[in-house]
Structure formats: structure tokens, C-alpha cells
């Protein structure tokens, strides 16, 4: 803290504000009758330099002039940008114990003259907004710099406003608080910015603009949509706009979409008809405005209007499939399955399905509605039956889809040939086939049907299927395909009134099974041994099992075991072997093999045949 300079004065030449790189002379003078109490020659004036209140230098060696005991002049050089404090102190040399006494101080500011302001940009937000201009000030001056924004225009009028930059605040924008109205649309305005500080001044180049150049309309507001006669595809978008708007841009998209539909509307006056909307779809609408067809700026986009278009009656055809199971000699169970319509076909919330089973000749009709995507009925085994299903929402129903109920695998001549299933990757299987060789009626379509080979899958889970045109001989199946699971795949060839099928198993990825089959019993019948087993639990199969192996060897023998390989059939759980010696104790075990390899061995069982050897 500097005492109020009672003892003397400090002056700076050429000035307390200097350009970067300049030197300054600081003179410290004692007032008359001030100083050390004994004699003037003992007065020693010292100059201390502080930056950010921290003493950084004693300038004792920088004296350039000295009136002993009265005044001293110090030269300071290499001052850094910003403010530096210099304090002059009096040191009475005969008294070493007393600290130097402050005389006076001075602050020197080092900076640069302002550069001409550049990139002036003015904006008025909305017809009732006010003009605000911003600019680039250029390099920091490190000095208090005043900026004057001056706007000249019609009516011989000039408007100006000032602000300043220093080490605490920056001035590069000013709002003039004045509104330009549409009656000035043809008028030209000139804006310039002048910067002044203690080291100089500079002016921007004049920047000319018109009302249309700078007025950015407010975004439209109060957006709403009216659907004509509750139409799901046609609607009138309405909004409020500023009075002078002549051009609007509309953008809209379904909520899950990534690209906007764009529309330009001239002189829309807050209303526009849209004709290509998708029914029962969540849409987002936004609008932007412009005051002039060719010039001017677009407003920001309005806030979004989010709404769902109304429903319309479903279109499209349901994809139907079925299963037939004979119950007894005169009854069969028909299970119908169908896939949900996709949203663009459903065009609303599907409330129910209308299902019809009709016996063609006797004209017997069974009708029902269901909310599910399957329906099961028991019907007589006699007669020709046809099924139809349609989907209904609040606005109506789709056209019914018909399918003839035939014996799906009844005609051997219609069975596709050379069916194969190859794993393509983790979640799909490529199924290929050849057409039936001697079909006596034309194939109308192929159906590829698949389901996981797990216990109860026929009753618990509906099938998955794909419809394939008659000239295609392959299908890539991926719906509900998981790795390490074996699927039964059927390829059906359907004519108008008959069906033939071929079956194969396939998986999308496989590993060797986790364990081998468990031998449950070994029995001897007519000089043959029957090995019985339980299948490997479904999760441990890890793909399609191609075959089982039964191994046997004499107990305590070190020889390689013998083996018998059995083609895997799900229905089979026993197999005979007949090459064992009587009254010799054998050890038997089983393994399972997938395309990836062989499982570890299952449990071991010992057995000693009693009968004659073959």
C-alpha cells in the first residue's frame, strides 16, 4: 500500500502508458524538508519493481541521474505487456536497522495500439428486435480500449454506442437498442467501429447493409396440424409467422428416420397441405421463415411439432402358414399361423384378426376373431378345406388372404431334391434344394419352414417360415436363428392342391458336444446286445449331432477300442451290436459327433455276454 505520497513524487517520461519495447524514465523526488533527519547526503532513493504484487527487482543499478539526497531518475526497459507497479523508497543509510520508507509509486502500462476492427456483422432478430453488431477486435491491446459503434442511415440519422475492453471484460458486441422496420427495406445503412486507447486509434472499413441483409425472422410458432376427414396421409400444417415473411421451408420426418422431407412454400400465409404422409406414424415437423425470396437469412428452425398421423385401413396381404395333425381316423387338428403386418401395411393398431375355415364342397364355414397370430381348430379329415385371414384396425380390415389346406408332405413326387443346409455365419443358414423330379402339377411356391430341435418345440413354439417363388432354389434363413442350436428345416413344394416336402437338420454355428450320451441299459436278445441310451440334454448338444459312436473293449485291455457309428435319429435311442465274445467282460461307452468334432465319452458300463458268439 502506497501512502498518499507525503514524502515526495514519482513521475514517468514519456508517459505512464508506453508501447511494447519502449523504455521509460522514472523520476523519484523528495518534497522539501523531507528525507533523513541528519543530512541530505544520507538520503538514498531506491526503486522497486512489482508484478502482480510480487517484488521482482530492485532497480538500484538502473540510475541514470542522481541529485544526491533530493531526486533520482531510473531507466526501465524490457517491460512486459500489462501493468507493472514501481515503488520509490527512501533508505536512510546511517540507520541500518530501519527498513526503507515508501515515498510514492507509479503504475506503468505496456500495450499496443488497437488494430482496425474487422468482420463486422449486424443482426436483428425478428421484425420487432433490435440491431446488434459484433466484430473482431484483433490482437489484445493490454490497455483499456474504447470502442464506438456508429450506424448511419436514412433520415440523416447517425446512431452510436460505446463500450470498452480491459483486463476484466471484452468488448466485441453491442446492441444499439434500435429497431429497423420493414418500411426501411430499400434503405442502406453504413456501420463502422472505431477503437481508441492511449497509444492510438483505428477504424474499421465501413460495412454496408440493408434491412433484408440483417433481419432474421423469428422462428414460426404455434405449429399445429389438421388431418382432413381424419385422413392418415393428408394433413394441413398451420403456424404463426411474422407479418413480412414471404418464404417458408418445411421439413418433416418419421421419428425413427434419419433424413428429412423438405418443402419450400411461397406466400404460404401460415398454411401448407401435405399429401404424402404415412398413416399411424409418429412425425416431427419444423418450419423456418425468410423475409425475401432471393435475399436475407432463414430463421432458426421452429420448435418441433411431434404428432402421430391417424390410422387408415390395413393394406397388404398376411403371410399365412399352417400345420396339420391327425387326431384319429376321422378328425384332424389344423393350426393356422400368420406374420404380423409391418407398420406401413398395418397403418394402425391391429385390434384383431378375422379367421375363416371353409369346407369347399359342403360349404361348412368356421369363423372367429382372435388377437393372436395363430388359431387352432379340430375339423373333419374329409373334404377340401381352405383358410383365410384378414387384419383389422379401427378404420377397417385388410383384404383376406386365402390358403388351401393340403397334405403338406403327402405327395412324394412333389418332394424337393438334394436339400442342403450350410451355416453362413453366426445367425443364418443357407438352405438350397433342387426342384421335384416328376411333379405331375406345377409348383406354385416353396415354403422353407424351421424350428429348433428341442423338447416340446412343436407344441410350445410356432414355426418360422419363408415363402419362396417357384423359380428360386435357395433361402437364407435368419429369423430366430441362434448359434449352437440344431434346427429341423423342411422345404415344402406346394401346387394348387398338393404338397411334398423334404427335411434336413442344420445349424448356424457348432461346437463339439459337451458330453456323450448316457447308456441306460445293455440287454442281450438272441445273441445280440442292445445298447440303450438317453440323448444328450439339448443345451449340451451345441449344434446338430451327425452320429453317435458306441465304443467297446475288453476290460483291462490296453488295445484300441472297437467302435460302431450310428446315423443320428432323434427317435432312436437303442442299437444292436453283435461282435462281442460270450463270457468276456467288456467296457462300453458312447460319444456324439457334430460337424465341429466329437464329444467327451459318456458314462462307462460293463457287460459280460452270456450267449454264443457269432
Amino acid at each position: 500500500n502506497i501512502d498518499v505520497c507525503k514524502l515526495g513524487t514519482v513521475t514517468v517520461q514519456p508517459a505512464p502508458v508506453i508501447p511494447l519495447g519502449s523504455a521509460a524514465n522514472i523520476s523519484c523526488s523528495l518534497n522539501p524538508k523531507q528525507g533523513c533527519s541528519h543530512y541530505p547526503s544520507s538520503n538514498e532513493l531506491i526503486l522497486l519493481k512489482f508484478v502482480n504484487d510480487v517484488l521482482v527487482e530492485n532497480l538500484h543499478g538502473k540510475k541514470v541521474h542522481d541529485h544526491t539526497g533530493h531526486s533520482s531518475t531510473f531507466q526501465v526497459t524490457n517491460l512486459s505487456l500489462g501493468m507493472t507497479l514501481f515503488v520509490c523508497k527512501l533508505n536512510c543509510s546511517n540507520s541500518q536497522k530501519k527498513p526503507p520508507v515508501p515515498v510514492c509509486g507509479v503504475e506503468i502500462s505496456v500495450g499496443v495500439a488497437p488494430e482496425p476492427p474487422q468482420n463486422i456483422s449486424c443482426v436483428q432478430e425478428g421484425e420487432n428486435g433490435t440491431v446488434a453488431c459484433s466484430w473482431n477486435s484483433g490482437k489484445v491491446t493490454y490497455l483499456k480500449t474504447n470502442y464506438t459503434l456508429q450506424l448511419s442511415g436514412p433520415n440523416n440519422l447517425t446512431c452510436q454506442k460505446q463500450c470498452f475492453s480491459d483486463n476484466r471484460q471484452n468488448c466485441n458486441r453491442l446492441d444499439l437498442g434500435i429497431n429497423l422496420s420493414p418500411d426501411l427495406a430499400e434503405s442502406r445503412f453504413i456501420v463502422r467501429v472505431t477503437a481508441i486507447n492511449d497509444l492510438g486509434n483505428s477504424s474499421s472499413l465501413p460495412h454496408t447493409f440493408t434491412f433484408l441483409d440483417i433481419v432474421i425472422p423469428l422462428p414460426p410458432w404455434d405449429i399445429r396440424i389438421n388431418f382432413l376427414n381424419a385422413s392418415g396421409s393428408r394433413g394441413t400444417l398451420q403456424w404463426e409467422d411474422e407479418g413480412q415473411v414471404v418464404l417458408n421451408q418445411l421439413r418433416y420426418q418419421p421419428l425413427n428416420s434419419t433424413s428429412w422431407n423438405m418443402v419450400n412454400a411461397t406466400n404460404a400465409k401460415g398454411k401448407y397441405d401435405l399429401r404424402d404422409l404415412r398413416p399411424f406414424t409418429e412425425y416431427e415437423f419444423q418450419i423456418s421463415s425468410k423475409l425475401h425470396l432471393s435475399g436475407g437469412s432463414w430463421s432458426n428452425w421452429s420448435e418441433s411439432l411431434r404428432t402421430r398421423t391417424p390410422e387408415e385401413e390395413p393394406v397388404g396381404i398376411l403371410d399365412i402358414w399352417y400345420m396339420k395333425q391327425d387326431i384319429d381316423y376321422d378328425r384332424q387338428q389344423i393350426s393356422l399361423f400368420w406374420k404380423s403386418l409391418n407398420p406401413s401395411e398395418a397403418r394402425g393398431k391391429i385390434l384383431h384378426y378375422q379367421v375363416t375355415l371353409q369346407e369347399v364342397t359342403k360349404k361348412t364355414t368356421l369363423q372367429n376373431t382372435t388377437r393372436h397370430t395363430s388359431w387352432t381348430r379340430v375339423i373333419p379329415r374329409t373334404g377340401a378345406w381352405t383358410a383365410s385371414v384378414s387384419a383389422a384396425n379401427s378404420k377397417g380390415a385388410s383384404a383376406p388372404t386365402h390358403i388351401n389346406i393340403v397334405d403338406l408332405c403327402g405327395t412324394g413326387l412333389l418332394a424337393p431334391h438334394q436339400v442342403s443346409a450350410k451355416s453362413e455365419n453366426m445367425d443364418n443358414i443357407l438352405v438350397t434344394w433342387q426342384p421335384p423330379k416328376k411333379a405331375d402339377s406345377a409348383v406354385r411356391e416353396y415354403i422353407v419352414e424351421w424350428r429348433a430341435l428341442q423338447p416340446g418345440s412343436i407344441t410350445k413354439f410356432p414355426p418360422h417360415w419363408l415363402r419362396i417363388p417357384p423359380d428360386n432354389m435357395s433361402a437364407l434363413i435368419s429369423e430366430n436363428i441362434k448359434p449352437y442350436i440344431c434346427y429341423e428345416i423342411r422345404v415344402h413344394a406346394l401346387s394348387e392342391s398338393q404338397g411334398g416336402c423334404s427335411s434336413i437338420r442344420g445349424d448356424s454355428k457348432h461346437k463339439a458336444p459337451v458330453s456323450g450320451p448316457h447308456i441306460t441299459a445293455i440287454t442281450e436278445k438272441k445273441e445280440r446286445l442292445f445298447i440303450s441310451w438317453t440323448h444328450i440334454p439339448f443345451p449340451e448338444q451345441r449344434g446338430c449331432i451327425l452320429h453317435y459312436r458306441i465304443y467297446w473293449k475288453e476290460r483291462d485291455s490296453t488295445a484300441q477300442p472297437e467302435l460302431c457309428e450310428i446315423q443320428y435319429r432323434r427317435s432312436q435311442n437303442s442299437h444292436p451290436i453283435s461282435s462281442l465274445q460270450p463270457r468276456v467282460t467288456y467296457v462300453l461307452w458312447m460319444t456324439a459327433v457334430t460337424a465341429a468334432g466329437e464329444s467327451p465319452q459318456g458314462n462307462e458300463r460293463e457287460f459280460c455276454p452270456q450267449g454264443k458268439a457269432n
Epitope: N155, G177, S181
Partner: nanobody, 127 residues
Framework: QVQLQESGGGLVQAGGSLRLSCAAS????????IGWFRQAPGKEREFVAA????????FFTDSVKDRFSISRDNAKNTVLLQMNSLKPEDTAVYYC????????????????????WGQGTQVTVSS
Amino acid sequence: QVQLQESGGGLVQAGGSLRLSCAASGFTFDDYTIGWFRQAPGKEREFVAALSWSAGSTFFTDSVKDRFSISRDNAKNTVLLQMNSLKPEDTAVYYCAAKNPPHRWSDITKSLQYAYWGQGTQVTVSS
């Protein structure tokens, strides 16, 4: 009641200076634009300068923009018009007026847009 009172007019030689003051009573200048107009004998009232109290912006007609300045004294609720380098053609009665928002460029110079007026103060510049 709302009143505006001008003061500071007088006789001055060409090249001299005068400082006019406009004091408000009955209301504060808070959101107003305060304008100075002048009327020479036989001529229409013309706009001279104005100050937007809230925005801090100043306005001048081209003939005075390099000679006159306008400022405010918040504490005294007054607006000051400093007139330098006066010319004989500056001779007129000077009126202070106050205008409500909105503050439009087109309206600043129009006397009809100003709701409140003072009585005026005479400024005479002799050659």
C-alpha cells in the same frame, strides 16, 4: 404530473459552446428515448439529437454529429446536450421531448412520435 424542463440556453458567439439540460419531473426516463428538437423562426421543428435511456445509444442528425454530444445524469434524472463549435444557423428554440418504446429508426426523428414536451429554451448564435 409529467413535466420536462429545459435550461442552459442563451446568447453565444459563433464557435462558442453551450450546455443545455433537460430535467424530468413526475416520471423517470427509465425506458424512454429523450430527444432534442429545435425550431428556427419561420421553419419547421427539426430533430437534433436523442438518447435511448435504457440502451445507452445516442442519435444525431448529420449536421451536428461531430459538434454536439448527448449524455445523461442518472442521479438527477436529466439529459444534457453539449453544443460545441456553434454556428449562426444553430440559432433556434431548443425543445426537450420524451418518447415511449418501441424505439424504431423511422420514429426517432419524427416529432409526432414524442408524447411529452418541454417549453423550450432559446439559443442564439451571433456572428
